[in-house]
Each structure stands twice: as C-alpha cells, then as structure tokens.
C-alpha cells in the first residue's frame, strides 16, 4: 500500500514538474527589464528563450521571434538545449512510469518488470530535473554577470552615432516557476526510485512444505501468492497543466495604484 | 467609429476646482489608455497624466502632483480629469486623448476650455 | 524628465517646397528591446486638437498622406513634407513617448512665404 501511494505520488509530482518545466520553457518572462532606477516606465522590455517582448504603456505589445540561430549566444542555446532535454527526458520518464505503476494492469506484467520500469523513470525524472534546474541557474547565472556589467548611466555606441541607454534585466518568472518544477521533478523521481525498492519482489526463505490428505494430494506453498491492491477501477489520468499557452496582458508591469513622475 | 466627446467650457475663480469629463464611445472602453493633454492660448502641449481604464492605474506629471485626479467610469465610458486649487496659469483647453501603438495618442476630442478668472 | 527641442521655430514655405524639421530629445528614444525610436509627430491647425501623423520616428498613421515621413533615431528625429500643400500650414509637434512624463517639443510653425 505504502510503495503503490509512493509510485503514485512520484508520479503526480512529476508530472506538475514537468507541466511546469514546458511552462516555463515556454514563458516570455525569463529577463524582465529591472525597474530599480526607473519604477514606472512607458515601454517595458522582456525575454523569453524563444522571444523577445515589448508592452507599451498603451497595452499594445510587440513579440519577436530569435530567428537567427547561428547568431544568438552560445549560453543561451545550451539553456535551451538544457530544457529541451529536460522536457524529453520526462516525457519519456512519464510514459514510461505510466505502465509502472502498480494500480495499473498490463498484461502478465510481472513485479520486477515494474520494478525496473518505476526505477529506469525515476532516473529520467531526476535527469529531467537535473536539466530543468542547470538551464535555470545557468540562465540566471547570464543575468547577474550582464546585470553588474552594465550601470543605469552606462551608455553603449550604436555604431558610433546613436547613442542608447543600455537596458538592464533581472530574473523574470519564469526562472522561478523553472527552479520550482525542476525541484517538484527530482522529488518526484526520487520517489520513484525509493518506490522501486518497495516493488522489487523480496527473495523467500521458507521451502515448500507437502501435505498429505488422504485421497487427494495437495502442495500447498506458503509464500506463493501476493495480494495486490485494487486501485485500477477508479484510476484517472487527470491533466494537470494546460500547454503553456499565455495572454500577452497575463502579467501587469504597473508598479502602484498611483504614481507621479 | 471611435469617438471622444468632453464637457462644455468651464469659468472657474482662482483656488477652486474643475472636474473635466470625456466620454467614450466606438470601442471598448477599458481596452485604451486615456491620456490628459492641455494647452494654453498660443503655446505648446503639455501632459498632465494617464488613466487606465481596466485597472484604474493612474500616472501623473510631477507638475501636477496633488492638484489633478483622473478617474474612470467603466460603467459610462467616461474618464475624469479633476484640477484643484485652481491658478489664473492653468487657463487653458483640456484634451483626452486615446493612447494606441507606439505610445501615441491617435484620437483626440475637441477639447474643453476652462477659464481661472477672479 | 526627457527635453525635447525643436528647430526653427518657424518655417515660411511655398506650396511643392520639400521641407525639413528637426526635434532633438535629451535622452535617446531608442528602446532595446525592439529597436523601436519612441518619438511621435503631431499636427495642430488652428482651433483644432492635434492630429497624429507619425509614431515610431518613422510609421505613418493610417490615412497620412505619404508626403509626410519621418526619419532618425536615438536623439534626433526628422520630420519632411516632400511637397508642400495649403492645406499642410500648420503648426508641428514632436512628442517623447518613451517615458514618462511624456514631453512634447515647442512646436514648429509652417507659414505661407
């Protein structure tokens, strides 16, 4: 009872960690534009893995794509190789943990197949939020050394005739919702693997004792038979996150209710 | 046909006040900013301040911080300009305008004078 | 707050003249994030509001005819009348639309020479 609520729970947890690793692989708001200098700006700049974004104070907000790949930064590719791997890794690890699961019945699937399978998805879940959260900290790790490079007054020479003032960002959401779903991943796949030991079917000691009644000869074999749980019947597979798709109006940059400037 | 009507020209005595309306019409109103311009006879155009209708979100010119209130009324598409404490200075014609792409306003009333005479 | 500063004051003009003014702003309007220049251009006739011509430095408002067009980035911004017409005497403002408070330009006279 006790391993089957562990799979059981491993599972959900990964399967949110994962929701949430495409989630944020997915999110706009990996860099937002730091307001310390400036709390109420008219045109707030954010980034994403895939694009980049800006909401004017008119609410009309403008999105572009990376379309370049040989051109964006060697960091960046290996965040988004990190996630990419991430989310495939647990994908696999989530079939896989599927028909692991003890409540589910396929077949004449014996207990060390399970056994095995909750173990080898257990792994993956680990990996995949292994990946999750060192794409995130290598993300967040760009940020900080960008952000102490460049100074609120430090200007940068647009080929030498324009001159802008250099856009600082800080970590946006979706490293924090990336860090939280690598975690719930991990937990979740090392629950799988302490699952596993629970599953692996447990060597007996005791031989096999004959017993004879007269007329009928019976071998009765303690230890032969294991009583298994019925959780199937009511069993669902509930979805739990929804794609990752988002409003571009979801996340207000209004600092306060009032403000002068 | 996106359309802005304000109120009708007001005569105010110095330190008093001045409520200024703008009604919408033409389009949903919480979906635009509404902005607050004036401008004095024979000079230039100057910002007041913001109104996000959605959220009621405002921002202000630091000139006039503690003298304007802009509110809104969801329910009669209308935004609210309130000038306090009134100097012979702010004379001058009020315009709402709607804020769209790019930050500009693209839709402007006609404007309302108002008049600080003693 | 973002200056805005416009040059000349005034410009008296004949109908087909191509004509040029500027706006030079204190800080640069150039955001990052899209490489957009937030500077917007208004015409005002007399005892009517302005009228948006130009947003982005350089997008026309629908409807603008295309004698009209704006140009530069960073702090200095162009706007040109390839050929003037009557009904084009008016007066021109340039408008920081990148933050706040935003801040409009003195205005540029077009006068009948």
């Known amino acids: 009872m006790a391993v089957t609520a562990c799979q059981g729970l491993g599972f959900v947890v990964s399967l949110i960690g994962i929701a949430g690793i495409i989630a944020a692989t997915c999110m706009d708001q990996w860099s937002t534009q730091d307001l310390y200098n400036n709390p109420v700006t008219a045109v707030f700049n954010y980034q994403g893995l895939w694009r980049s974004c800006v909401r004017e104070s008119s609410g009309f907000t403008e999105c572009r794509g990376y379309f370049t790949l040989l051109g964006l930064p060697a960091m960046l590719q290996a965040v988004r190789a990190l996630m990419i791997v991430g989310i495939v890794l647990g994908a696999i690890g989530l079939l896989v943990s599927i028909f692991a699961l003890k409540c589910i019945r396929i077949g004449s699937m014996e207990d060390s197949a399970k056994a095995n399978m909750t173990l080898t998805s257990g792994i993956m879940f680990i990996v995949s939020g292994l990946c999750a959260i060192a794409g995130v900290s290598v993300f967040a790790n760009m940020l900080v050394t960008n952000f102490w490079m460049s100074t609120a007054n430090m200007y940068t020479g647009m080929g030498g005739m324009v001159q802008t003032v250099q856009t600082r960002y800080t970590f946006g959401a979706a490293l924090f919702v990336g860090w939280v779903a690598g975690g719930l991943t991990l937990i979740g796949g090392v629950m799988m693997c302490i699952a596993c030991r629970g599953l692996a079917p447990e060597e007996t000691n005791y031989k096999a004792v004959s017993y004879h009644a007269s007329g009928h000869s019976v071998a009765y074999k303690p230890g032969g038979f294991k009583a298994s749980t019925g959780f199937g019947s009511n069993t669902k597979n509930k979805k739990i996150y929804d794609g990752g798709a988002r409003t571009e109006d979801e996340v207000q940059s209004y600092p306060s209710k009032h403000d002068y400037v | 046909q996106v359309q802005l009507v304000q109120s009708g020209a007001e005569v105010k005595k110095p330190g008093a006040s001045v409520k200024v309306s703008c009604k919408a019409s033409?389009?949903?109103?919480?979906?635009?900013?509404i902005n607050w311009v004036r401008q004095a006879t024979g000079q230039g155009l100057e910002w007041i301040g913001e109104i996000h209708p959605r959220g009621g979100n405002t921002y202000y010119s630091e000139k006039f911080r503690g003298r304007v209130t802009l509110t809104a009324d969801t329910s009669i598409s209308t935004a609210y300009m309130e000038l306090s404490s009134l100097r012979s200075e702010d004379t001058a014609v009020y315009y709402c305008?709607?804020?769209?792409?790019?930050?500009?306003?693209?839709?402007w009333d006609q404007g309302t004078t108002v008049t600080v005479s003693s | 707050d973002i200056v805005m500063t416009q040059s000349p004051s005034s410009l008296a003009v004949s109908a087909g003249e191509m004509v040029t003014m500027n706006c030079k702003s204190s800080?640069?309007?150039?955001?990052?994030?899209?490489?957009?220049?937030?500077l917007t251009w208004y015409q005002q006739k007399p005892g009517q509001p302005p009228k948006l011509l130009i947003y982005w430095a350089s997008t026309r408002e629908s409807g603008v005819p295309d004698r009209f067009s704006g140009s530069g980035s960073g702090t200095d911004f162009t706007l040109t009348i390839s050929s003037v017409q009557a009904e084009d005497l008016a007066v021109y403002y340039c408008?920081?639309?990148?933050?706040?408070?935003?801040?409009f330009g003195q205005g540029t006279k077009l006068e009948r020479k």
């Open positions: 408008q920081n639309s990148y933050n706040y408070p935003y801040t």
């Open positions: 800080q640069s309007l150039l955001n990052s994030g899209n490489q957009r220049n937030y």
């Open positions: 305008a709607i804020l769209r792409r790019g930050n500009a306003m693209d839709y």
């Open positions: 033409g389009y949903t109103f919480t979906s635009y900013v």
